[in-house]
């Protein structure tokens, strides 16, 4: 019996087609992805093949103005239109709190939403009961397939799930649910979830009875053969893990941003064992037309976005200096504003010993693309912020050793004075440079805001200590020459859309007046 | 024809009786003021004398939890109960914006509310039309008396009147209104207003046709004879000004906080000339009983206040270190929080050349009386803040020379190490002390945040420049040994209630996490 698994993950609000790098579509003839194009491909496969499941491994939420404005209603609407068969909860599904998951998505989705390792307690338990499930048994043709969900255990540090959801260890939580499915005579089981490729592989290895793992969170691109675009495969598709009980378990993920549709064909024997598996992600490029009716619906929904982007988010009473002349040479107040917003967006007071899990921000000055003039009645709009941060990036959470951070700050000024983008703007960091010293030895003071303290204050950076830092995904991926970050990072979790982070902060603050306050000094 | 003028000014939300220093009443047998006691005295005088006017010269708004909770409704209600005959608008009447004046007070007051030098424009002009007046002619016995109002021209810098009210020069605006009254055959004219004693005297001198000036704003205490409490008279009551056209014009003011009832008897001839004037403020001490019916009404209104003071205003995720061990010795995050709130409360971006009219805050560490523990679910209540700031003070605006500020910072550490209260917490200031140097010469660096700039940044203090600073009224009055501030200040405007400033900021911010960030350093 043959099953076709179509899968997406980490779509992050890319409802419209995008450029090849998943930023805003500029030249339509070269654009990719988007729900209208995905619909075309999914329907094509459904018409051609008998047993098809369309699955999403989480993080539909967060990533473009679509999420900012529609807050998840757009996810439910278009996933319903695509007739997804199941979805796993990702960490970003909690970005607007549990209410922001329940109302727009859980209550509106016509497909099951899954996570076996999230347990509700207190008053939430009854409120959320039945709105998400640990597993779901789906009829496919004449057979049944069990789908069991999982979500990153780190979600409380990455999003806003509140205090009434407990995130358990994935493997510990999955095993009893899979066992239950077995007792229900379900012999074909897919683990669908959002904990990253390493955990996906562990699940394949450790959870008895899981036949296939469909993952997300780490934006992993797998491919067999010559890859069709710029993504470099982390392994073959599917990635085969030998389980502890000797089975060959295919593990898949489909990069991110709706650029690819994962396509996996599995052959099962009559006892539900996987006999063979093959496939590849399908690049959703312009050779696949966008379905015009879905496109028309997208265009209807777009209207509200265009209105939103010119509305006032808040006011500034100071010039927000995002000029290259400032931000690539010295502390600039636009950099301070953005870093302050990045920290504010990552407040997770989950432990009495730590006032917060993260206190530091770094931001390449070259990533700040425009100032904002306060003389337009102080008004700041989404449109203004999109000029400052035009690349559609995210502000991510990484873990780095102090020594890596020191290297990063040396890199920040290794060729100072040439208006290059690597000069770092900061938050929760006080740095002093001595430019008379040779490159690689110019950082003479580097103090960082403590986290394991009840009153935040600045202490000297310790080389061997592991620190959490918020930074643009561009830097996490080694951009602007920050190879040491990419090479040495100990953990990397994708965060919220850059503009959304700053816009939320400005809306919250109502009136802003960031200063140049001595975070960066030259001795 | 004899007229009795009863007058109050700068009552600042003291609806209940207070201690002698106008803070919260502790020992009722020694308490003073409050509307129930005022009612008793006013009614007594009304019964005894034929021609009585009860006037208020502005700043009923702002000062205690009464205003925080009731937002002006309490002012209208109890002033109506006292049957005030007229009120002038003070700067604080605009603290909640024009809407916060119109709805609770202007629309509800049963007495005229006056200001001749405030002109509405744009959409507000029709909305506010008739709700306040430049003048009002009041019948008193068989005569008529004209009352013409005025308000500090500085209100846009002191409060939140918005962009659709123009504050004109008082004298320029008053003269045509007085002339108009004269053409209406009104020959007894009182100028009732809120611009401070210096302006009151100027009005008496310059505005032809004004017979009496009843003022406010500067909390001026005038008295003839031996003063009955702690206030030291600034002059005799009434203070007589000789006008440019040779008339003797009595000028009065009645301190503040409802502690006194101004009592002025004027004798007019048949042409409306002042023949004589005499009187004194009446100390509303416990020898005057509180009216039991008004008291009962006060107690009914109180219930909501008690509920409010235990409700969550916002959250802290850090320990708010308001301990003496910290705030009297070094930068403390409670000091930073309070100073940040003080600046935030004084944002008035009225000029393109200045991002704000004020950027600096100083706060005596000894005025911070308690920490707030974050381990109570982070909750911050009014009750918590009242423990931090228990003295019922205000955060005022002063103008000082740089040299005065330098002296203040030297005083801050002149006897460092003895846990004395004069150690300054700051905002918009970076100070470096060298304690190895002799007292009076310990400030080695004093940088202040520019105001006449579009991007706020720190520049060295200039000795001869005039700076605006926000500070506690306690310091403006020379408390904690800051005699240099009291002696050398160039201007002093009373501000908002201390707790209200901090509570508003916390409510706005929702979650706070002030750090110790290097505002105060020791070299």
């Amino acid at each position: 019996w043959e099953l076709t698994i179509l899968h997406t993950n980490d779509v992050h609000s890319r409802l419209e087609q995008t450029s090849e790098d998943s930023s805003k579509c500029v030249n339509a003839s070269r654009c990719m992805g988007g729900v209208a194009r995905l619909f075309t491909k999914v329907q094509q496969i459904r018409r051609a093949e008998p047993n098809v499941l369309l699955l999403d491994a989480g993080d539909q939420y967060q990533g473009t103005i679509w999420f900012t404005v529609y807050k998840g209603a757009e996810v439910a609407h278009f996933m319903n239109a695509l007739r997804y068969d199941a979805m796993a909860l990702g960490n970003h599904e909690f970005d607007n709190g549990v209410e922001g998951l329940i109302e727009p998505l859980l209550k509106e989705a016509k497909f099951p939403i899954l996570s076996a390792n999230i347990k509700a307690k207190g008053p939430l338990a009854s409120q959320i009961s039945g709105l998400y499930l640990p597993y779901k048994v789906l009829p496919v043709g004449d057979e049944v397939v069990g789908i069991v969900g999982y979500t990153s255990k780190e979600t409380p540090f990455l999003s806003n799930p509140g205090t009434n959801l407990v995130f358990e260890d994935e493997i510990t939580a999955l095993q009893p649910e899979v066992d239950k499915l077995k007792t229900l005579n379900v012999n074909k089981i897919i683990a669908l979830g959002h904990s990253g490729f390493e955990m996906d592989k562990l699940i394949a290895q450790k959870v008895r009875g899981v036949d296939v793992v469909v993952g997300g969170h780490s934006n992993t691109f797998l491919y067999t053969g010559n890859p069709p675009s710029k993504e470099v495969p982390a392994g073959k598709y599917p990635f085969i893990v030998t389980s502890d009980d000797g089975r060959k378990v295919p593990v898949v993920q489909a990069y991110a941003f709706g650029k690819y549709l994962g396509y996996l064909k599995i052959e099962f024997d009559e006892r539900g064992n996987v006999i063979s598996s093959h496939g590849n992600p399908i690049l959703l490029n312009s050779s696949i037309p966008e379905d015009p009716s879905i496109k028309a619906d997208i265009n209807k929904w777009r209207i509200k976005l265009d209105n939103y982007s010119t509305q006032e988010l808040g006011k500034t009473i100071v010039y927000l200096d995002g000029s290259s002349q400032s931000c690539r040479f010295r502390e600039c107040n636009m950099g301070n504003l953005i870093c302050d917003a990045m920290i504010n967006n990552n407040l997770r007071h989950t432990d009495e010993m730590f006032w917060n899990h993260v206190s530091m921000c770094i931001l390449n000055g070259g990533g700040i693309r425009s100032p904002i003039d306060e003389r337009n009645n102080g008004t700041i709009t989404w449109e203004n912020l999109a000029a400052v941060l035009p690349f559609g990036g995210t502000f991510d959470l990484v873990q780095l050793k102090g020594s890596t951070l020191k290297k990063a700050f040396e890199h920040s000024v290794h060729r100072y004075g040439q208006s290059t983008g690597e000069f770092l703007q900061v938050g929760g960091i006080h740095v002093v440079y001595d430019l008379s010293r040779k490159p690689g030895d110019r950082v003479v003071k580097l103090d960082v805001l403590c986290t394991k303290c009840r009153v935040p204050s600045y202490d000297p950076l310790k080389m061997d200590e592991v620190y959490k830092v918020i930074l643009p995904n561009f830097l996490a991926n080694g951009g602007d020459g920050f190879q040491m970050i990419k090479d040495e990072l100990l953990r990397h979790d994708s965060g919220d859309q850059d503009i959304n982070v700053v816009s939320t902060y400005i809306s919250k603050m109502k009136v802003i007046y960031p200063a140049v306050e001595g975070r960066i000094k030259f001795s | 024809w004899e007229l009795t003028i009863l007058h109050t000014n700068d009552v600042h939300s003291r609806l209940e009786q207070t201690s002698e220093d106008s803070s919260k009443c502790v020992n009722a047998s020694r308490c003073m003021g409050g509307v129930a006691r005022l009612f008793t005295k006013v009614q007594q005088i009304r019964r005894a004398e034929p021609n009585v006017l009860l006037l208020d010269a502005g700043d009923q708004y702002q000062g205690t939890i009464w205003f925080t909770v009731y937002k002006g409704a309490e002012v209208a209600h109890f002033m109506n109960a006292l049957r005030y005959d007229a009120m002038a608008l003070g700067n604080h009447e605009f603290d909640n914006g024009v809407e916060g004046l119109i709805e609770p007070l202007l629309k509800e007051a049963k007495f005229p509310i006056l200001s001749a030098n405030i002109k509405a424009k744009g959409p507000l002009a029709s909305q506010i039309s008739g709700l306040y007046l430049p003048y009002k002619v009041l019948p008193v016995g068989d005569e008529v008396v004209g009352i013409v109002g005025y308000t500090s021209k500085e209100t846009p810098f002191l409060s939140n009147p918005g962009t659709n009210l123009v504050f004109e020069d008082e004298i320029t605006a008053l003269q045509p209104e007085v002339d108009k009254l004269k053409t209406l055959n009104v020959n007894k004219i009182i100028a009732l207003g809120h611009s401070g004693f210096e302006m009151d005297k100027l009005i008496a001198q310059k505005v032809r046709g004004v017979d009496v000036v009843v003022g406010g704003h500067s909390n001026t205490f005038l008295y003839t004879g031996n003063p009955p409490s702690k206030e030291v008279p600034a002059g005799k009551y009434p203070f007589i000004v000789t006008s440019d056209d040779g008339r003797k014009v009595p000028v009065v003011q009645a301190y503040a906080f409802g502690k006194y009832l101004g009592y002025l008897k004027i004798e007019f001839d048949e042409r409306g000339n002042v023949i004589s004037s005499h009187g004194n403020p009446i100390l509303l001490n416990s020898s005057i009983p509180e009216d039991p019916s008004i008291k009962a009404d006060i107690n009914k209104w109180r219930i909501k206040l008690d509920n409010y003071s235990t409700q969550e205003l916002g959250k802290t995720i850090v320990y708010l270190d308001g301990s003496s061990q910290s705030c009297r010795f070094r930068e403390c995050n409670m000091g930073n929080l309070i100073c940040d709130a003080m600046i935030n409360n004084n944002l008035r971006h009225t000029d393109e050349m200045f991002w704000n009219h004020v950027s600096m805050c100083i706060l005596n560490g000894g005025g911070i009386r308690s920490p707030i523990d974050e381990r109570n679910n982070g909750t911050i209540t009014w009750e918590n803040l009242a423990a931090v700031l228990p003295f019922g003070g205000t955060f005022d605006l002063v103008q000082l020379k740089g040299s005065t500020l330098k002296k203040a910072f030297e005083h801050s550490v002149h006897r460092y190490g003895q846990s004395t209260g004069e150690f300054l917490q700051v905002g918009g200031i970076h100070v470096v002390y060298d304690l190895s140097r002799k007292p009076g010469d310990r400030v080695v660096k004093l940088d202040v945040l520019c105001t006449k700039c579009r991007v706020p940044s720190y520049d060295p203090l200039k000795m001869d420049e005039v700076y605006k600073v926000i500070l506690p009224n306690f310091l403006a009055n020379g408390g904690d040994g800051f005699q240099m501030i009291k002696d050398e200040l160039l201007r002093h405007d009373s501000g908002d209630q201390d707790i209200n400033v901090v509570s508003t900021y916390i409510s706005k911010m929702k979650v706070i996490y002030p750090a110790v960030e290097g505002r105060i350093k020791f070299s």
Epitope: Q44, N80, A81, S287, I288, K295 | -
Partner: antibody, heavy 121, light 111 residues
Amino acid sequence: EVQLKESGAELVKPGASVKISCKATGYTFTGYWIEWVKQRPGRGLEWIGEILPGSDITNYNEKFKGKATITADTSSNTAYMQLSSLTTEDSAIYYCARRGYDETGYAMDYWGQGTSVTVSS
Amino acid sequence: DIVMTQSPASLAVSLGQRATISCKASQSVDYDGDSYMNWYQQKPGQPPKLLIHAASNLESGIPARFSGSGSGTDFTLNIHPVEEEDAAVYFCQQSKEVPWTFGEGTKLEIK
């Protein structure tokens, strides 16, 4: 065999509403869009709107917004179109059609027999 | 909206001859090498019937005497040789974008 069977002719009074149906057989109902088209006697074809059964997605010709409401019931594989506030201008034959995909150029490959609606007092 | 202009409004063609109907779109209906133009035939008392999709692709069961051509904005339906049963009204329709729009129709009579 793909078939679309529409409900019978309707004679209705001005100001009233009418709801016509279109039952689909021979294919997966939720897999294809259902289109509605108006044809007045001796006139051309006017597209009214469409629905993707099983979803909330409908698209309408601006001209028919407020006039037509398209719904679908996946349990009975039936699409519906309600026409409200009828006038004589609404007298026409109304067709439902199945819309194909990119491989058939998004053309309307199967049509119902049409429902005649006559508005007359 | 894309406006479809069909010509002629009617034409009479002798049996065995060629009938040519034109359709012009107000903007291109091409996408990635495909033209989203369809042709329908409608006989009296019957619903329209799809003849050609994507400008030139004949529906199964439709005789080969029907052919379509064109790209961009200009399209043609050819019938050759015309037979008696081809008397009908022919409509073009663009399916590039919603709202779908039809031509006004061309009435073909057989002489």
